[in-house]
């Protein structure tokens, strides 16, 4: 049904869905704080631009009795229930912030006439790709996939002279929401990653993973997994690992690797960590002081969602354009806006672009060091350490298939 929007005559409201099922187990109070901090900034920016308008947020809470698992896998209906609640109350803002679970976002997008923009801190899955009025402010699975394929093919760096075309993927089903969808995308037979690889097998049992580490008949030396170092240690422990094994640990939303006093444990020496470039000012900002390094990005995405709305509102008001139009709903893409922690770029499909950072453990210093960075906006690699102090032979990443010999030349032109 068509719900009237509180979105005109100098008063602009943001509907924030506060769902029990969430991509990260973040207390809703922290998300409220992030939204409120964002509102303060937006009001200031609009005022500085000479726009005398009111911007507020309405927090819509779902029924905790029905949706209380906190688990995204059971979130399919929660978003729709909240939309129904909004519809009944005739209380829709100019923009919807939330949900963060892929299932609920997909379902809401499918089952509603979305004539308003939807901003999500999450919705990582491939099923939420290419949605015309959906904006995602945390790196979706598609961006990870493009990095991995790019890195696999690379063979013109002094530390990576072999193209790779194989991989194991460890996925046991207990992953966090972001990891679940990242690995799901790698597993999907129709995905870009699967299409570009010649061999890919999903390991679902701990024992399968552990056996591969020393299996002389393994079909690939490369294993992708998702989570933090502790997750890897639980699985790998202090087991011996063949010298040409490379573990790619996807841990995007974790700043801890960049903290000054962090030393890499010994079990990380065969591991390349893929994470995001850390923010500058988040460590001592008021809203993030109580947040763990992992959850900072989630709360920040809510805050940036507010700033994005403020950015678009300012542009439309300055141009004298109507906010409750399809044009506004479709405008939240292919742009750069001033986020809380610097510029934020959205691609043509409204997905956030970022700088991914690939780290290795220096055998000299036992510190995490940057090997290269990757700009998802231009799909470009920027080498950083041209002579890394790797654990691998000759300070080069090994071939992905043992015994394939000096076959460097899988050229991709």
């Amino acid at each position: 049904s068509q719900v009237s929007q509180n979105c005109h005559n100098g008063s602009y409201e943001i509907s924030v869905l506060m769902m029990g099922n969430s991509a990260f187990a973040e207390p809703l109070k922290n998300l409220e704080d992030a939204v409120n901090e964002g509102l303060e900034i937006v009001r200031g920016r609009l005022q500085n631009a000479g726009l005398n308008v009111t911007v507020n947020a309405t927090f819509m809470y779902s029924d905790g009795l029905i949706h209380n698992s906190g688990d995204c896998r059971s979130s399919t209906c929660e978003g729709l229930d909240l939309l129904r609640k909004i519809s009944n109350a005739q209380r829709m803002g100019c923009v919807l912030i939330g949900p963060s679970c892929t299932y609920s976002t997909f379902q809401m997008y499918l089952d509603t006439e979305l004539s308003y923009p939807m901003i999500s801190a999450g919705s990582f899955g491939l099923s939420c790709d290419y949605k015309e009025t959906l904006t995602r402010l945390m790196s979706p699975a598609r961006k990870l996939m493009y990095f991995l394929v790019n890195f696999w093919k690379t063979n013109d760096l002094p530390f990576k002279t072999y193209s790779w075309s194989t991989s194991y993927v460890y996925k046991n089903g207990t992953e966090t929401e972001d990891c679940f969808w990242y690995l799901n995308a790698l597993e999907a037979s129709v995905s870009y990653f699967s299409h570009e690889l010649g061999f890919k097998v999903v390991l679902r049992q701990d024992k399968e993973f552990q056996d591969i580490l020393m299996d002389h008949n393994r079909k690939s030396n490369v294993i992708i997994m998702c989570g933090g170092p502790e997750f890897l240690y639980k699985l790998k422990g202090d087991r011996a690992v063949a010298e040409d094994i490379v573990i790619i640990l996807v841990d995007l939303f974790n700043d801890q690797y960049f903290e000054d006093n962090v030393t890499a444990p010994d079990y990380m020496k065969n591991v390349l960590v893929l994470t995001l470039s850390p923010g500058n000012s988040l460590l001592n900002s008021s809203f993030s002081r109580n947040l763990s390094p992992t959850k900072r990005d989630f709360a920040l995405a809510y805050l940036n969602g507010i700033l994005l709305f403020g950015h678009m509102l300012k542009i439309f008001l300055e141009n004298g354009e109507n906010i409750t139009t399809p044009k506004f709903a479709h405008a939240f893409r292919n742009l750069t806006f001033e986020g809380y922690d610097g510029p934020v770029t959205l691609d043509d499909w409204g997905d956030v672009d970022s700088t991914m950072v690939l780290l290795y453990t220096s055998v000299d210093t036992k510190k995490y060091k940057v090997l290269l960075t990757y700009d998802t906006h231009v799909n470009k690699t920027y080498p950083v350490d041209m002579s890394p102090t790797f654990t691998w032979k000759n300070s080069k990443l090994p071939n992905d298939i043992t015994g394939r010999g000096p076959q460097h030349h899988h050229h991709h032109h």
């Epitope: 013109d156 002094p158 530390f159 940057v370 960075t373 460097h408």
Partner: antibody, heavy 118, light 106 residues
Framework: EVQLVQSGAEVKKPGASVKVSCKAS????????MNWVKQAPGQRLEWMGV????????NYNQKFKDKATITRDTSASTAYMELSSLRSEDTAVYYC???????????WGQGTTVTVSS | DIQLTQSPSFLSASPGDRVTITCSAS?????MYWYQQKPGSSPKSWIY???NLASGVPSRFSGSGSGTEYTLTISSLQPEDFATYYC?????????FGGGTKVEIK
């Protein structure tokens, strides 16, 4: 357009030090590695080292590890290379060269001539 | 370190000639890079990743090769092509350059 402008020619006595600068413009300085290359009279080009301005990571050619020190000032978009304990064999033209992977050394400075003579 | 040997060191040719310069590596490399340098000037990136022409390089230039043998070819030499050409590898650390091939007017 991309430009790398190096400091002027230097004449130094043996045992002295010299610091060569390379000011970058026309691109984001911290986005690209900066290399230093030596060209001695009648000799082939020799790569000395590379620095990543964003992270400060520096890799030296072992041959020049005790000779060259590479630094940068990101606020001035400038890379520096200091040569210590100068000897006559350090007489050469020194170039800075930017990386734009996969095109290594895609732009070069005009070169700085360092002459070591007593 | 990987040694690169260029041949010939000197090459006399006339405008319109087809010219081939070779670069041999002491061990196998994936790609070769080429630079042009004129007297009194700094080197310029000319060909990267074996066969890709750098920005502004005329299409009469081409690069090819694999393993230890690489070539730079000028299909029809022009007056502005008289210069010294260097090959370079970054397959192994540190990157190394060839000794150069000076292309002179006959």
């Amino acid at each position: 357009e991309v430009q790398l402008v190096q400091s002027g020619a230097e004449v130094k006595k043996p045992g002295a030090s010299v610091k060569v600068s390379c000011k970058a413009s026309g691109y984001t300085f911290t986005d690209h590695n900066m290399n230093w290359v030596k060209q001695a009279p009648g000799q082939r080009l020799e790569w000395m080292g590379v620095m990543n301005p964003k992270f400060g990571t520096i890799n030296y050619n072992q041959k020049f590890k005790d000779k060259a020190t590479i630094t940068r000032d990101t606020s001035a978009s400038t890379a520096y290379m200091e040569l210590s304990s100068l000897r006559s064999e350090d007489t050469a033209v020194y170039y800075c060269a930017r990386d734009d992977y996969p095109n290594y050394f895609d732009y070069w400075g005009q070169g700085t001539t360092v002459t070591v003579s007593s | 370190d990987i040694q690169l040997t260029q041949s010939p060191s000197f090459l006399s040719a006339s405008p319109g000639d087809r010219v081939t310069i070779t670069c041999s590596a002491s061990s196998s490399v994936n790609y070769m890079y080429w630079y042009q340098q004129k007297p009194g000037s700094s080197p310029k990136s000319w060909i990267y990743r074996t066969q890709n022409l750098a920005s502004g390089v005329p299409s009469r230039f081409s690069g090819s090769g694999s393993g230890t043998e690489y070539t730079l070819t000028i299909s029809s030499l022009q007056p502005e092509d008289f210069a010294t050409y260097y090959c370079q590898q970054y397959h192994d650390y540190p990157p190394t350059f060839g000794g150069g091939t000076k292309v002179e007017i006959k």
